[in-house]
Amino acid sequence: KSSNEATNITPKHNMKAFLDELKAENIKKFLYNFTQIPHLAGTEQNFQLAKQIQSQWKEFGLDSVELAHYDVLLSYPNKTHPNYISIINEDGNEIFNTSLFEPPPPGYENVSDIVPPFSAFSPQGMPEGDLVYVNYARTEDFFKLERDMKINCSGKIVIARYGKVFRGNKVKNAQLAGAKGVILYSDPADYFAPGVKSYPDGWNLPGGGVQRGNILNLNGAGDPLTPGYPANEYAYRRGIAEAVGLPSIPVHPIGYYDAQKLLEKMGGSAPPDSSWRGSLKVPYNVGPGFTGNFSTQKVKMHIHSTNEVTRIYNVIGTLRGAVEPDRYVILGGHRDSWVFGGIDPQSGAAVVHEIVRSFGTLKKEGWRPRRTILFASWDAEEFGLLGSTEWAEENSRLLQERGVAYINADSSIEGNYTLRVDCTPLMYSLVHNLTKELKSPDEGFEGKSLYESWTKKSPSPEFSGMPRISKLGSGNDFEVFFQRLGIASGRARYTKNWETNKFSGYPLYHSVYETYELVEKFYDPMFKYHLTVAQVRGGMVFELANSIVLPFDCRDYAVVLRKYADKIYSISMKHPQEMKTYSVSFDSLFSAVKNFTEIASKFSERLQDFDKSNPIVLRMMNDQLMFLERAFIDPLGLPDRPFYRHVIYAPSSHNKYAGESFPGIYDALFDIESKVDPSKAWGEVKRQIYVAAFTVQAAAETLSEVA
């Protein structure tokens, strides 16, 4: 087949026609439509939105749009028995209680079904005891407490500030420290940018605002009751005691007004250094317990949430490819929100909606993409990436054979400063080339390319004249596609200036104040940043689905593999004596990386020269590119994390949001000096080097000439 048989317009005009059809005004309209009521996973409102999106995608012109439902474990507060935390006196009387809900934003006072702040999947319980302040509850914070300060958290209720790492890691760390309850709070140091008013007058977090969120440690398992398999009608479900990743101690989130009431009375040890102090007018004493006058008072948690198996609905739309219908490019983002979802997820869902509309418009004019494009509106992302994971589990055999790429589409904005991209190295060149063709929306960069403003504002730390592109971690719906299945993945959104804004995420994240007005008034009144993100996400999908040769450059993987090998080697070399004692060598890894580099270079040369009019050879070369990401998958997975199977990247064991390179080696080396059996520990390091070297070498060989 001729490469243009799929279309009645020239390839260059295709992309322009697609991008020109994207309109900021439509994104604005869709965002408004998606944010007027809450769309909590498992609720009737979110089911109705799924049906609305299904109907609209059909109208837009997709070939088919289906609902895929699953019955998964979700978590909800008890409507008649609210969750709260008390300060109790020596007689057990409650002298202070934390808030039961956030003050509703203006205009939303009469909206029903606003779920009060809660930590999803917290067990029930009413623990009482002394408080210990544990900073961000990171691994290093507990090391500081336990090893340096000799403070024992066993039997204590810990209070931790949100930020820096995924909340589930905080809870896991607290559990391992022996805590019997966890209070999470948003400190103004992390969620209140100086010089900006709090909502509704600005985009900062008010004192009554609270961040919701799940506290699971799923490690990629999906539904806690059906790990590895879809939660369908005939699923075998584990008992709750065997469920994956559930916390074992009660957890509850609060705002900074309530946190002030708890922290102002803290006694015990002073904070170890200034990095443990937030911005509240409290001493940030670590504890345990309250100071002198209040030493007989305790903290009591009242948690009554329930875990329930509930039906969720993904929307899956298909635009069939004309030439390679058995090759799938997927654009997916979630639909469920904690409350209104003004940013998370609907700023992303509105962009997906407009991308679908644009593709549909082209299709109605007679165009089709070369490859099949799948569009997904995922459910229950907020409860542990459940919708995407269950669908991928159900379709894993198809995906591992046919999946070309996955582009994620959660929140389009977390700021309005510059672009932020996390992706596989295979997509670096695609992203660079695309952003060079797009106009920058930034003030002061009129007439300049997006690439130029992005590079200026967010330069690569390694390569001058290039923008920063980060590793994929997790905490979003690309996880199953990339970390489990090895499908090349990427994500893009507009972000804040990380140099000047040190707060974590955006201040109103997962609060009731994440409204349409937040976006329209304060973040993107002209929706120009949303439009740019639509162009980046849509443009990536367009190129991946339509270019004759897949827009992957395997040489970029070679470059990062060398960088990651150097990094992990330098970490190991902090223990030169042990390396010598236990004969630890990285030679095999560096050798494999060298081989990969040479083979990738030769493959790229062949890619320039081969006969693109020969459909068999074209398909063969494209398959080598498509399957390269797959080649980094270890079927056995990482130690104790069977669903994290990518050998080059995994979510950090200390922060699900962050990506770690050579995670098997990294985890084997982590805190190795404290291991009781150094011989065994260094043996595991050697095993992980072996696994990594083998995997890199095996991946390299997939790029060799086939015969």
């Epitope: 709260y84 002298i95 202070f96 209680n97 934390t98 808030s99 039961l100 809900f101 956030e102 003050p103 509703p104 203006p106 006072e109 008010p206 004192g207 009554g208 605002g209 705002g255 007004y257 309530d258 002030q260 009431k261």
Partner: antibody, heavy 124, light 110 residues
Amino acid sequence: EVQLVESGGGVVQPGRSLRLSCAASGFSFSGYGMHWVRQAPGKGLEWVAVISYDGSNKYYADSVKGRFTISRDNSKNTLYLQMNSLRVEDTAVYYCARDRIWGSRGYYYGMDVWGQGTTVTVSS
Amino acid sequence: QSALTQPASVSGSPGQSITISCTGASSDVGGYNYVSWYQQHPGKAPKLMIYEVSNRPSGVSNRFSGSKSGNTASLTISGLQAEDEADYYCSSYTITSTLVFGGGTKLTVL
């Protein structure tokens, strides 16, 4: 227009009960802490009780503790004061008042909106 | 919960400045910066004049100012005017999580 209107006052015998209401309008009632303050004839102001915006915290003056209950119905934009075991010394004009700060967990930032008051007379 | 101590009355001529004191204890006025001042004309509801010791709500004349020293808070009215004649009450947050008012001060403009 931001407004508080008290109702429910009247003449009642000692030992009996009365329920006062305060209807709020013109502002986001469900985001504000609310107070009851009273003023006996010819006397000064006496703070009676406060309730947080969500009803999670209620505090009372010693003189009414155990007899009076403050409550609110945010869906009706209404504040209540249930007064039981009334005494002659409870005779006063009862005002409801709004705490100044929206969304605050405190209730000590100053009362910036007041009703016109409703008169309660306890007499045998 | 004893009432805060205020002078029963103060007076001043138009244009003069007057100060009303409000004395409490370390468990209320001295311990917190949550002192408010209210003006009440006869037969009317009170009006907030000062909050958090020294802050003026919008719409309140800058002739009204507040301060605190130790366990005593003060309200100062400068450039006294006839319409300032009213009863003035202070209030403070207390250690027992309650509020307490002062006994009130009658201001007479001579």
